[in-house]
Amino acid sequence: QLPPGKPEIFKCRSPNKETFTCWWRPGTDGGLPTNYSLTYHREGETLMHECPDYITGGPNSCHFGKQYTSMWRTYIMMVNATNQMGSSFSDELYVDVTYIVQPDPPLELAVEVKQPEDRKPYLWIKWSPPTLIDLKTGWFTLLYEIRLKPEKAAEWEIHFAGQQTEFKILSLHPGQKYLVQVRCKPDHGYWSAWSPATFIQIPSDFTMNDEQKLISEEDLGGEQKLISEEDLHHHHHH
């Protein structure tokens, strides 16, 4: 029977700069029941506080609700592990909420085959930003990435959509079922998880005759890029 091993705070994330959660990994338990507590103070303060919510984020977590989250202050936190034989402390972690934002994935992903009479057919993809993020305040700029592939393909084709919430893709294999997903990231922060896959059957008469494929960030002022088939494979397959 031993004192507990050193815990480690390994991740802090905020969905929207208004709340955040940190998670720790326990060290060895020393063969005894072990209690964990997270304490923190804000930079420039000496008063220590205990984690306000150990429940919301699941096991080995601390959740900071709105009233405990300040954007303009750095949090200095550590985890204390205690059993009957003694205690151990994690290293201190410095957390600035601005830089730990990981949004929820975008919503309402819609995929449609468009076959205008006067133009080439294309796949039209659109989505909505995650609900927790208020883009109107200007606090956030979200960037988007789309990935798609034929159902049985192992490789995804990835397209960067910038700040657009719509995208057109012309180079597709007719007669295949495609999976499409989208994710987002703030200018400072982490990519969201990919959204659940949406799928669409590409009609067998979806034809591309030109060896050049037009990929457009929608005709809403988005810059159109003319990309050759060769460039497409080099730049968009990950």
Epitope: D104, P105, L107, E108, L109, K152, A154, L179, P196, I200
Partner: antibody, heavy 114, light 107 residues
């Protein structure tokens, strides 16, 4: 023809863990993100989580936080779902499901009983 | 999480008649909705995805409509093999959730 074949029925005691396997054929696991869904006797369907073998990412329902682990072995095209700290309410048929929902495993009955 | 509500819980219909099943989402799921059929002792079977696209091998008597929060599954002329449980499920965002199911029984 795509097939998902699951491991056999299990009986476990409360507090134990169970690991259900799902062998993919007619497809490579790297191409197939896997959902796990369960159904308690006489009840409806409940989504547990998703495992993407391509990047190893997992997403799960909040109620399973800290109890469910989804993994995959691309060399054998097999996905796994492990549920720990079992309780009687976890007695259910567990299904693995292909990403487009049209391929389902046959189901694995897990019974939790002392 | 999005709550999916199916109605009615049980629908009694005579063979050859039309059956209309409803599914409501607590917030918009666009067209990211699937319908399943499940028979006793079997895994569910995908009927429709994208709210209205029939899955491979599904007969034309099954059709779906709706987008946003209100969805309908219609079976135009019920065959004996259609008496089963039906579930809707959204895949708009995480977590995915299912409706509670509608049992279609012989009248």
């Amino acid at each position: 023809q795509v097939q998902l074949v699951q491991s056999g029925a299990e009986v476990q005691k409360p507090g134990a863990s169970v690991k259900v396997s799902c062998k993919v054929s007619g497809y490579t696991l790297t191409a197939l993100s896997i959902h796990w869904v369960r159904q308690a006797p006489g009840k409806g369907l409940e989504w547990m989580g998703n495992f993407d073998p391509g990047d190893g990412e997992t997403i799960h329902a909040q109620k399973f936080q800290g109890r469910v682990t989804m993994t995959g072995d691309t060399s054998t095209d097999t996905a796994y779902m492990e549920l720990s700290s079992l309780r009687s309410e976890d007695t259910a048929v567990y299904y693995c499901v292909g990403v487009t929902f049209d391929y389902w495993g046959q189901g694995t009955l897990v019974t939790v009983s002392s | 999480e999005i709550v999916m509500t199916q109605s009615p819980a049980t629908l009694s219909v005579s063979p050859g008649e039309r059956a209309t099943l409803s599914c409501r989402a607590s917030q918009s799921v666009a067209s990211n909705l699937a319908w399943y059929q499940q028979k006793p002792g079997q895994a569910p079977r995908l009927l429709l995805y994208g709210a209205s696209t029939r899955a491979t091998g599904i007969p034309a008597r099954f059709s779906g409509s709706g987008s946003g929060t209100e969805f309908t599954l219609t079976i135009s002329s019920l065959q004996s093999e259609d008496f089963a449980l039906y579930y809707c499920q959204h895949y708009n965002n995480w977590p995915l959730t299912f409706g509670g199911g509608t049992k279609v029984e012989i009248k």
